[in-house]
């Protein structure tokens, strides 16, 4: 073999051992009767050599690197040639490398002729063995843009400051053209832009730079998708990690030509948009990472382009004929901004009247169907009113607050089911008794069930939110003075499986003056956290609430408050707390606007905690959090 490299060609040829094989006999490059395992040929050199074996392709690889300097002179733009021609090279696995160095202000664009490129992930290989490895540069740091095979959608890659393109050809491959050209562009002001062109239906899997390692800190990378107008594109994230941000927030942004809401900003953990018509851009923006513990940002995603879905002809029956004072609304879930580019998602009544919102009322049987590619874009909100106008008729009457099975069988997620419970003023009150004891949601012990009950006053002038409650706690019942709304709110699709855990009975009971009374029967196993209504906004003025806390005979209860002082400042009146032993009626009274809150106290018998508010000055509200823990009694002190 003879390889002659023209002077000033800036080409270096390197023949070296490839990955070691288990072949018995080694092979050498023979030059001037010397046996070597590596041969480097520089511009202006002419070297004659042979191999010491019959099949050097099993032993050696050849790298041909051309350095293109766009810093000191004009750049040789246009179609890139394979130099030296593959016919002049020994038949080894070949890697042609083009290393282009340019100023930061210069954009470089690699244009790939058909077939376009398909990105592959770590551990994957190309069927024909032809791979394209592309990397960029940020100052002195090399950044891997990705490894690509033929027969894909990637048509152009734009970078700045420099690009390194490596084309790997197996020894048996007849290819004798590079398949790409280089053009200059204005600065792209980001790490890179990858253009992906879909001619018809198909999918593309793409990855952030350096994948599976971390995306460079505080960088921006953009993918431009060219999609025929009659097709729809959906994005799904296959794999992602977030780094630890010190400043800014990692995010993806969608830009849709013609949209009035550009850019659409999403967190990586959000559900990404689907059913987009026409072209769109997706950008990944990094953040300033924590120097001590940066973590890594990485993203692997898929774009699926297909014809709009053939909508299901399935009819769903919603029978509300036996219901009273109830309305069911199917509507789009709120999105951060309305995305006008997303095709409509409709719900139809009797398959004729279709709209994005539909409200069904009680007293009838309804037939509905859906014209929507993704039913998770919709949810249901239901309101039902249970009212008592005649206190003589209602007293002691009970109603079950349960989601009807017809509603649970719909293919749309239930968001809220609200019961408005109305009583005659100053005549009756309400008691809520759950099928399973409830836990109050607190920061210290959050609910992690698929649904919760939100209990709030339903009197328009009163801003009183009792709290969020979920099954699996110690609250046996909640008594409230007057009108309330109880909302069953779902937090996960698994509510369908957990629906059997719901179950709340409301009864009308004789009127009492306190705003609310919670009956608590703690379990010996866990700490019960309780907090005053209207947490964060403060207990309303002149409002009184009580907790009736049961202590079993063989247990002792520890009552603990979570701050030293209540923090309330009274404008008028006094705020106080009474802790009263139910057996002896012995009580302790604490002035909440003056005294420190009591230290942890032990109670051997059931007791009351009553908190009554004054009219506080603004900003100095009454918020109390306390816990009750049962432990076995060691000594009987009675």
């Amino acid at each position: 073999f003879e390889i002659a490299l023209p002077r000033e060609s800036n080409i270096t040829v390197l023949i070296k051992l490839g990955t070691p094989t288990l072949l018995a006999k080694p092979c050498y490059i023979v030059i001037s009767k010397r046996h070597i395992t590596m041969l480097s040929i520089k511009s202006g050199e002419r070297i004659v050599f042979t191999f010491s074996c019959q099949s050097p392709e099993n032993h050696f690889v050849i790298e041909i690197q051309k350095n293109i300097d766009c810093m000191s002179g004009p750049c040789p733009f246009g179609e890139v040639q394979l130099q030296p021609s593959t016919s002049l090279l020994p038949t080894l696995n070949r890697t042609f490398i083009w290393d282009v160095k340019a100023h930061k202000s210069i954009g470089l664009e690699l244009q790939f002729s058909i077939p376009r490129l398909r990105q592959i992930g770590p551990g994957e290989s190309c069927p024909d063995g032809v791979t394209h490895s592309i990397s960029g540069r940020i100052d002195a740091t090399v950044v891997r843009i990705g490894t690509f095979c033929s027969n894909g959608t990637v048509s152009r890659i734009k970078m700045q400051e420099g690009v390194k393109m490596a084309l790997h050809l197996p020894w048996f491959h007849p290819r004798n053209v590079s398949g790409f050209s280089i053009a200059n562009r204005s600065s792209i002001k980001r790490l890179c832009i990858i253009e992906s062109v879909f001619e018809g239906e198909g999918s593309a899997t793409l990855m952030s730079a350096n994948y599976p390692e971390g995306f460079p800190e505080d960088e921006l990378m953009t993918w431009q998708f060219v999609v025929p107008a009659h097709l729809r594109a959906s994005v799904s994230f296959l794999n992602f990690n977030l780094s630890n941000c010190e400043r800014k927030e990692e995010r993806v942004e969608y830009y849709i030509p013609g949209s009035t809401t550009n850019p659409e900003v999403f967190k990586l953990e959000d559900k990404q948009p689907g059913n987009m018509a026409g072209n769109f851009n997706l950008s990944l923006q990094g953040c300033d990472q924590d120097a001590q513990s940066p973590g890594i940002l990485r993203l692997q995603f898929q774009v699926l382009v297909q014809h709009p879905q053939n909508e299901s002809n399935k009819i769903y029956v919603v029978d509300l004929s036996n219901e009273r004072a109830m309305s069911l609304t199917i509507e789009p879930r709120p999105v951060k901004q309305s995305r006008k580019f997303v095709p409509g998602c409709f719900v139809c009544l009797e398959s004729r009247t279709c709209s994005s919102n539909l409200t069904l009322t009680s007293g009838s049987k309804h037939k509905i169907s859906f014209l929507c590619d993704d039913l998770t874009r919709l949810w249901m909100n239901v309101e039902k009113t249970i009212s008592c106008t005649d206190h003589r008729y209602c007293q002691r009457k009970s109603y079950s607050l349960q989601v009807p099975s017809d509603i649970l069988h719909l293919p749309v997620e239930l968001h809220d089911f609200s019961w408005k419970l109305l009583v005659p003023k100053d005549r009756l009150s309400l008691v809520l008794v759950p099928a399973q004891k409830l836990q109050q949601h607190t920061h210290e012990k959050p609910c992690n069930t698929s649904f919760s009950y939100l209990v709030a006053s339903a009197i328009p002038s009163q801003d009183l939110y009792f709290g969020s409650f979920c099954p699996g706690g110690s609250i046996k019942q909640i008594q409230v003075k007057q009108n309330i709304s109880v909302t069953l709110r779902t937090f996960a699709p698994s509510f369908q499986q957990e629906a059997s855990r719901q179950g709340l009975t409301v009864s009308f009971i004789p009127y009492f003056k306190e705003e609310g009374v919670f009956t608590v029967t703690p379990d010996t196993k866990s700490k019960v956290y309780l907090r005053t209504p209207n947490w964060d906004r403060g207990l309303p003025s002149l409002t009184s609430v009580s907790w009736n806390i049961s202590v079993p005979r063989d247990q002792v209860a520890c009552l603990t408050f979570f701050k030293e002082r209540s923090g309330v400042v009274c404008q008028t009146g006094r705020a106080f707390m009474i802790i009263q032993e139910q057996r002896t009626r012995a009580e302790e009274i604490f002035s909440l606007d003056e005294d420190v809150l009591p230290k942890p106290s032990f109670h051997h018998h059931s007791f009351w905690v009553n908190i009554s508010n004054c009219s506080p000055t603004s900003g100095k509200q009454l918020d109390l959090l306390f816990s009750v823990t049962l432990t076995p009694r060691t000594v009987d002190l009675t």
Epitope: R34, H35, M38, S52
Partner: antibody, heavy 117, light 111 residues
Framework: EVQLQESGAELARPGASVKLSCKAS????????MQWVKQRPGQGLEWIGA????????RYTQKFKGKATLTADKSSSTAYMQLSSLASEDSAVYYC??????????WGQGTLVTVSS | NIVLTQSPASLAVSLGQRATISCRAS??????????MHWYQQKPGQPPKLLIY???NLESGVPARFSGSGSRTDFTLTIDPVEADDAATYYC?????????FGGGTKLEIK
């Protein structure tokens, strides 16, 4: 298994000549250099020269041009070194060394040449 | 001629410690991307034994305690950790240019 078998010890008079042999086996004799190295007692290694049996190409260090003549017989896979005009300073152990790439991994056991009147 | 200067001429190293031998060439022994420098071990009464070829490649059967490094004019043989059996004289040889030449040798003694 590769072997280089050198001829036995030689006792020669000053001014005489000796021809040392080195028979190779276990590798392709014609494809690799055979080098010859001199080592005087308690001294270091001194390169004499090398021959490429495939085409008879020879290389010598200046000091041994005219003193040593390297030849090879392809048919018997044997390399020879003739030392002429022997003097007492030619008394030494002479090694042949060969290889099957990439370098001289195989050495003969050495031939002791003693020049004495 | 390319002159190879080995240093030190002799050295004593404790068992388990590292031994480093240097070989400096009067001009570069690199070409075609290779360093044509090789290392041998010789024990009394025996022919030399190849340890390292082309500056850094370990000959088959030689323990990984031996390593070679360097390029152009400066080369190093390292033995780490040294064992009792390593007591010998070590030589470098170049074949980049005719005549091929040897270094003067370094005698390694184990303490």
């Amino acid at each position: 298994e590769v072997q280089l078998q050198e001829s036995g010890a030689e006792l020669a008079r000053p001014g005489a000549s000796v021809k040392l042999s080195c028979k190779a086996s276990g590798y392709t004799f014609t494809s690799y250099w055979m080098q010859w190295v001199k080592q005087r007692p308690g001294q270091g290694l001194e390169w004499i020269g090398a021959i490429y049996p495939g085409d008879g190409d020879t290389r010598y260090t200046q000091k041994f041009k005219g003193k040593a003549t390297l030849t090879a017989d392809k048919s018997s896979s044997t390399a020879y070194m003739q030392l002429s005009s022997l003097a007492s300073e030619d008394s030494a152990v002479y090694y042949c060394a060969g290889y099957d790439a990439p370098w001289f991994a195989y050495w003969g056991q050495g031939t002791l040449v003693t020049v004495s009147s | 001629n390319i002159v190879l200067t080995q240093s030190p001429a002799s050295l004593a190293v404790s068992l388990g410690q590292r031994a480093t031998i240097s070989c400096r060439a009067s001009e570069s022994v690199d070409s075609y991307g290779n360093s044509f420098m090789h290392w041998y071990q010789q024990k009394p009464g025996q022919p030399p034994k190849l340890l390292i070829y082309l500056a850094s490649n370990l000959e088959s059967g030689v323990p990984a305690r031996f390593s070679g490094s360097g390029s152009r004019t400066d080369f190093t043989l390292t033995i780490d950790p040294v064992e009792a059996d390593d007591a010998a004289t070590y030589y470098c040889q170049q074949n980049n240019e005719d005549p091929w030449t040897f270094g003067g040798g370094t005698k390694l003694e184990i303490k």
